[in-house]
Amino acid sequence: YDFTNCDFEKIKAAYLSTISKDLITYMSGTKSTEFNNTVSCSNRPHCLTEIQSLTFNPTAGCASLAKEMFAMKTKAALAIWCPGYSETQINATQAMKKRRKRKVTTNKCLEQVSQLQGLWRRFNRPLLKQQ
């Protein structure tokens, strides 16, 4: 999906009003020195591409993020504010239902959510672009 035509300000508002707080709750109890961000993004569409990938694509050691509250709210925000996004996600959602497992918060998941917080920071304020 090409995120170029999303309403970035509305997505930012959704993030700051709820999603950010859910991410903080998920990370509660984790030391702020624990994880170094290794995933970066250069502009808002790129940030959303990386955010979508880390939030919804299962990775080795962390298969369950898509069922977390912040993920569901992220999905809703993208569906509302990115034209045509929900249509592209129907197949992905059906595939995800088939491999649904119980929620487990692993260290790998915590690291992934720390990466997500960093990506959202850059989405909110693309550093090097005269926005």
Epitope: L16, S20, S32, N36, N37, R121, R122, N124, R125, Q131
Partner: antibody
Framework: QVQLQQSGAELVRPGTSVKVSCKAS????????IEWVKQRPGQGLEWIGV????????NYNENFKGKATLTADKSSSTAYIELSRLTSEDSAVYFC????????????WGQGTTLTVSS | SIVMTQTPKFLLVSAGDRVTISCKAS??????VTWYQQKPGQSPKLLIY???NHYTGVPDRFTGSGYGTDFTFTISSVQAEDLAVYFC?????????FGAGTKLELK
Amino acid sequence: QVQLQQSGAELVRPGTSVKVSCKASGYAFTNYLIEWVKQRPGQGLEWIGVIDPGNGDTNYNENFKGKATLTADKSSSTAYIELSRLTSEDSAVYFCAREDNTGTAFDYWGQGTTLTVSS
Amino acid sequence: SIVMTQTPKFLLVSAGDRVTISCKASQSVSSDVTWYQQKPGQSPKLLIYYVSNHYTGVPDRFTGSGYGTDFTFTISSVQAEDLAVYFCQQHHRFPLTFGAGTKLELK
């Protein structure tokens, strides 16, 4: 806890350069941007620029291009601002600050470094 | 650059007063406005981010509102420890810019 510790006050001659440091602790240094802000005595706040310690990317206020250079040393978790060709107009308190967890504000600030340029 | 025009420059207050500070942006900054408090000889402290969100530990008497170009910062009931200079800042476009500040002084 998060802390930004800046180097001490400087008294320097016009035409020279100075390098002010900002040592970060209590968080993963490369995860958050570091901002620099100038405040002249009794005046408001002026944003100088920002650096991403993770990759060294910077963005400067046009008013400070050629005047300020921002760098960061990952190994020591320290950000630096170098000010060159100093004049009396550069006499001010310089603050470093960290972006907050959402990327929309500055949540932790250094204590400030007073720079006095005088002959 | 976006100019943030902050008014008034000074406010004479008594404990318990309701205080309102205005900040007007020269062009729309959406909701990207932050408010800071600075006491003499100290660094600024973050109070409100993204127009109306309280930073951790900031008392409820501090509130922010607005959108686009017009923003308001309110202290519902001023306490002695609130005597300080307050700055608005826009976080929407580079270069980031601050208002000139509003100094709260005791009547």
